[in-house]
Interface confidence: low
Amino acid sequence: ENSFEMQKGDQNPQIAAHVISEASSKTTSVLQWAEKGYYTMSNNLVTLENGKQLTVKRQGLYYIYAQVTFCSNREASSQAPFIASLCLKSPGRFERILLRAANTHSSAKPCGQQSIHLGGVFELQPGASVFVNVTDPSQVSHGTGFTSFGLLKL
Amino acid sequence: ENSFEMQKGDQNPQIAAHVISEASSKTTSVLQWAEKGYYTMSNNLVTLENGKQLTVKRQGLYYIYAQVTFCSNREASSQAPFIASLCLKSPGRFERILLRAANTHSSAKPCGQQSIHLGGVFELQPGASVFVNVTDPSQVSHGTGFTSFGLLKL
Amino acid sequence: ENSFEMQKGDQNPQIAAHVISEASSKTTSVLQWAEKGYYTMSNNLVTLENGKQLTVKRQGLYYIYAQVTFCSNREASSQAPFIASLCLKSPGRFERILLRAANTHSSAKPCGQQSIHLGGVFELQPGASVFVNVTDPSQVSHGTGFTSFGLLKL
């Protein structure tokens, strides 16, 4: 049994996750994550599914966060800014956006790095999943510590 | 006894810290902090050591965060971006990077201000210390509220 | 009775809020918020007052955060950067700044989007209110998820 599981007692175990970005050849705008490096996965009440979403088993309030570092150039990118979105998919419901951040591309060449941080408190239902979307995954920086995603149950 | 200490009972006291940036003449890349202004230090289970690192006495999951505001100019700075790193030093272990953020320098003159926010959930061992590194401490803004560092135990 | 209220027992109910930005015709620099969309208001121990401030009934340590996305242009704006401030008003005290972030305006036209995230742990007294100030509210982005404000009691 995971040591975190017992810290608050069986009725109210600690639930937290922190996962690390993973470069992907997929063309999807959903970022990919892995349990690697200095990751956190407190117990089986939160899981990383298909490398793309954190799924919780218990209803409650969660602080959910994501950090995305990216490198882009104004001339080489579309006119639209780089947008990172924290999204929610609850069982039997449509996906919805919880949080977004937008940064205009840099004029630096070949590209300019910028970091985005998202975070907020949301109620999640049992089986709810959260994931991170970006406008251009190829611009995301995957060096140590630059891009990560996590949550903690209050 | 600090009033925070007892809020969750002796077995599970509240542990939290929030410290304020301090300008330093030191040439080190490690930022300096102080218990001044509207700071938080819940009890002696977390301490600020040597003005540079937050050290915890109890093992567990912590949400750790840092905010750094800096002012830099592309022409006056190195080509490398401004990088802020949240780092961990555990007893008997090498230092490691937990989180990083990178922002390309501004073209604004004399310098352009930017703010970085880092935050994530990590397991800390007893005696573990966390600290913040930046590429150029002379560019950091120390005005009220601009640069701070903290943690809370889940 | 709200389901969150009971999760920690009557003595220590969960206290958390997450509110969504609201465009305002007011000329004040204080941002306006609403309980709309995917908002959180755990119980009556935290309330949104006058659409502008989160007010707490219980003393304790709170993690308070705000995210502001804005769109500005260097030529059309004042020389001063865009600054977002998280402020505290406690009963019988002057207002004070808890956290600030500053971003120099973009050279992109008509305007360049940028996102700011603020967050930290602070002690609040009963009746204390927190609110968010910005240098130019007309530049704030109110699209889904871009600008939000919240807190959670440790």
Epitope: - | E35, G37 | G92, R93
Partner: nanobody, 128 residues
Amino acid sequence: EVQLVESGGGLVQPGGSLRLSCAASGFTLEYYAIGWFRQAPGKEREGVSCISSEGSTSYTDSVKGRFTISRDNAKNTVYLQMNSLKPEDTAVYYCATDPDRGFLGSSCDTQSHQYGYWGQGTLVTVSS
């Protein structure tokens, strides 16, 4: 021992200026808030201005734009520059602090009972 000593008061005509000083000893002023209060004859003591440990300043509505608070950490002294003085500014002016309150002592209060240490006061009279 914590000590505060005010100076700079006096008689001045309406529209004139004065600069009050509050010299602190026994503690490092820069880590704590210093508040200026005033008490007019027959009235309660009221908060006028404050400078917090990190340098943020606050003013009561009636003096905004006329009074400026500042601090010289090297001299361990806080100043209150009073311009465009009015007869209703006539009062004994006190500075106050409370380094015993830890981090709460670094923040500004409007209520005098929140401060543990007071100077002896300096009289400001605005009259023609």
